[in-house]
């Protein structure tokens, strides 16, 4: 297993609709034809997998059916979008990239993106 540098933004603020997007960029030492991207969430020293996708030559990442993630790829950049976020989901979201093929296998883990989620204020009651 060889190490690889992965860069991602330090901070992202989710939209009022609970959507956060960020770019995960990896320094590929060669031309990988099969890449696996995993988003991990670290909160209170616990790490959980948010979503993962293996992609090849296309520009759209395909996630499992119940995933809250969507994404596209362009060169060595992966544009990730996480949906359905609420205030309790605030935390550090880490991008992990694996170059699955061809050998050798490379692994890179970013420093994480702190995603802040603020639940929208409920609309005040109307007289109408």
């Amino acid at each position: 297993c060889k190490a690889m540098h992965v860069a991602q933004p330090a901070v992202v603020l989710a939209s009022s609709r609970g959507i956060a997007s960020f770019v995960c960029e990896y320094a590929s030492p060669g031309k990988a034809t099969e890449v696996r991207v995993t988003v991990l969430r670290q909160a209170d020293s616990q790490v959980t997998e948010v979503c993962a996708a293996t992609y090849m030559m296309g520009n759209e990442l395909t996630f499992l059916d119940d995933s809250i993630c969507t994404g596209t790829s362009s060169g060595n950049q992966v544009n990730l979008t996480i949906q359905g976020l609420r205030a309790m989901d605030t935390g550090l979201y880490i991008c992990k990239v694996e170059l699955m093929y061809p050998p050798p296998y490379y692994l890179g883990i970013g420093n994480g993106t702190q995603i802040y989620v603020i639940d929208p204020e409920p609309c005040p009651d109307s007289d109408f």
Partner: antibody, heavy 115, light 106 residues
Amino acid sequence: QVQLVQSGAEVKKPGASVKVSCKASGYTFTSYWINWVKQAPGQGLEWMGRIAPGSGTTYYNEMFTGRVTMTRDTSTSTAYMELSSLRSEDTAVYYCARGDYFDYWDQGTMVTVSS
Amino acid sequence: DIQLTQSPSFLSASVGDRVTITCSASKSVSYIHWYQQKPGKAPKLLIYDTSTLASGVPPRFSGSGSGPEFSLTISSLQPEDFATYYCQQRTTYPLTFGGGTKLEIK
């Protein structure tokens, strides 16, 4: 030029298994997914699953999980789809298609399940 | 699973007509891809990533849309366009196809 060539038609009894091959040429086999698609007579298209020929990573449609196995042989640039416990509803044309965009298809393999 | 609903299921039209087929997803998807299939033949990629024409596809075909609603338009039908058309999504597994739209000569 890019070509996918599948094995010939098969007639099987209920409960049996069938293994269909898909030989690729004209491109780097390990750079594109190989997808398998089912089309029953007079019906639409149903994605069965896919395999990444390099690592062998597979994704299956849950409708077929437990009955379908996708493998590959990189030395011959051939992908295989094996379907077990065959029943009459499995009578269909099975296609292999290349990549994320399903940009190249073979003409398909007719599998008939009949007692 | 993401369901793709195509409408209409059947469409009768004449050579020279402009026709539009719609594809509605049960959940928002990033892109839609379109295929054409003629009887006894394998499907053929027409449009990928919602609006990009596949190699060799004539410009009378166009695709558009976003989120859950997408469409395929043929600006001026030619005799060779009478076929069945399928939309497909690959935002999430399992990849799914629409039920198809059979385009027939009026």
